[in-house]
Interface confidence: medium
């Protein structure tokens, strides 16, 4: 699927748009809203009943080069006594984000947009149990 | 910018860092991942810290639709199915990159934008201090 074009009725001044070669698009990678203010609580990854660890993945041919991934620490959830309860499940919560991939083909360089699925944390769920008919 | 390893046989004109503006292919890799969290899993209903999903739509952005989570309760759901206020449902927020049409309404000109989304909720033990 390609990025959907906006219908021409939506344009105010199509002539003011920069010329772009067919099959490609112009992308400014100077990020808008670089400094977001996150109001998330502290240490929730350790205090959650479905705790998780963070791993930083690094790829020099990706922008941004650093992507942080979460991994659930347990299969079950942590109960009030601090013990793992395997009657419940710790499951990953995932979110898509975009990255720019830099590709080297011989001495030429091309850029490709890529969707990356990031695991942002974990939540504790009641398992789906299928009973034998 | 970030440093890119280069083929030593290539001319030295190539910049080691990502340029500020790049031309990218219109096709997106891994584009077929499911973008509707209501369809992709029912965790939002089965979680002990359940959440509702709200549709955030913006035609000037790609993806134009992003689903936002909002915790249903202050507390968490216990084994009896009741809300336990000794525990807290808290949102898990994540910064993601999207494309913003720039100039506005242009079909093939974009800028990366960082936005903050609430992805889901998790149940945490509250931080409380008791009287000594």
């Amino acid at each position: 699927r390609k990025i959907p074009k906006v219908g021409h009725t939506f344009f105010q001044k199509p002539e003011s748009c920069p010329p772009v070669p067919g099959g490609s698009m112009k992308l400014d990678i100077g990020i808008i809203n670089e400094n977001q203010r996150v109001s998330m609580s502290r240490n929730i990854e350790s205090r959650s009943t479905s705790p998780w660890n963070y791993t930083v993945t690094w790829d020099p041919n990706r922008y941004p080069s650093e992507v942080v991934q979460a991994q659930c620490r347990n299969l079950g959830c942590i109960n009030a006594q601090g013990k793992e309860d395997i009657s419940m499940n710790s499951v990953p919560i995932q979110q898509e984000t975009l990255v720019v991939r830099r590709k080297h083909q011989g001495c030429s360089v091309s850029f490709q947009l890529e969707k990356v699925l990031v695991t942002v944390g974990c939540t504790c769920v009641t398992p789906v149990i299928h009973h034998v008919q | 910018g970030i440093t890119i390893p280069r083929n030593p046989g290539c001319p030295n004109s190539e910049d080691k860092n990502f340029p500020r503006t790049v031309m990218v292919n219109l096709n997106i890799h891994n584009r077929n991942t499911n973008t509707n969290p209501k369809r992709s899993s029912d965790y939002y209903n089965r979680s002990t810290s359940p959440w509702n999903l709200h549709r955030n739509e913006d035609p000037e952005r790609y993806p134009s639709v992003i689903w936002e989570a909002k915790c249903r309760h202050l507390g968490c759901i216990n084994a009896d199915g009741n809300v336990d206020y000794h525990m807290n449902s808290v949102p898990i927020q994540q910064e993601i990159l999207v494309l913003r049409r720039e100039p506005p309404h242009c079909p093939n000109s974009f800028r990366l934008e960082k936005i903050l989304v609430s992805v889901g909720c998790t149940c945490v033990t509250p931080i409380v201090h008791h009287v000594a």
Epitope: S39 | L74, N88, I127, V128, H129, V131
Partner: antibody, heavy 124, light 111 residues
């Protein structure tokens, strides 16, 4: 009884400083996020700042950012608002308020206890 | 100019139901719970509703809150003369990085 008592208001010239205090009693102060909210004469409520239960998170309204500092002393059960470079538009009744739920909910979920307010007048 | 929009005034006769709307966006009401406050002249505000629809103890059940998408509303049923006051909605806003109050609605009890 849960109580908040503000003090430190008064008349001050533009450009000068003032420090407001809010003494808390009747609850475990160090468990709760605390806010400052102001109300200019004849106007609506305007949020000023918030501090988390342990002081690690602080947020400010754009109108006061860089001029006002929120802080707390959990050993004294007291909340503070240091106001520098005061302007006439800072003239208002200043209220301190307690977040309704402990721990994580420093940024939302209702301000369930309010002080009676202290008046700050910035005038030359 | 508040990012939470409320009608400046609302009115009703005793016994009637009055509703106050609060319109926001995805960065506030769409993502965070809404609180409602009542303020009678000369007094400090009082928490009326928290977490969209929860009533603190002591608040009559004539007051109810609801939220849908990026809007919220407060309903006062069986309107009484003591309900005459200013009402404010409020929530956290991620774009501003702060708690925000609505512009306020003055409720008048007629007759």
């Amino acid at each position: 009884e849960v109580q908040l008592l503000e003090s430190g208001g008064g008349v001050v010239q533009p450009g000068r400083s003032l420090r407001l205090s809010c003494a808390a009693s009747g609850f475990i102060f160090r468990n709760y996020g605390m806010h400052w909210v102001r109300q200019a004469p004849g106007k609506g409520l305007e949020w000023v700042a918030v501090i988390s239960y342990d002081g690690s998170n602080k947020y400010y309204a754009d109108s006061v950012k860089g001029r006002f500092t929120i802080s707390r002393d959990n050993s004294k059960n007291t909340l503070y608002l240091e106001m520098n470079s005061l302007r006439p538009e800072d003239t208002a009744v200043y209220y301190c308020a307690k977040v309704g739920a402990s721990g994580d909910y420093y940024y939302s979920y209702g301000l369930d206890v309010w002080g009676q307010g202290t008046t700050v007048t910035v005038s030359s | 100019q508040s990012v939470l929009t409320q009608p400046p005034s609302a009115s009703g006769t005793p016994g009637q139901t009055v509703s106050i709307s609060c319109s926001g966006s995805n960065s506030n009401i769409g993502r965070h719970p809404v609180d409602w406050y009542q303020q009678v002249p000369g007094a400090a505000p009082k928490l009326l509703i928290y977490y969209d629809d929860q009533r603190p103890s002591g608040v009559p059940d004539r007051f109810s809150g609801s939220q849908s998408g990026t809007s919220a509303s407060l309903a006062i049923s069986g309107l009484q003369s003591e309900d005459e006051a200013d009402y404010y909605c409020a929530t956290w806003d991620d774009s501003l990085g702060g708690y925000v109050f609505g512009s306020g609605t003055k409720v008048t009890v007629l007759g």
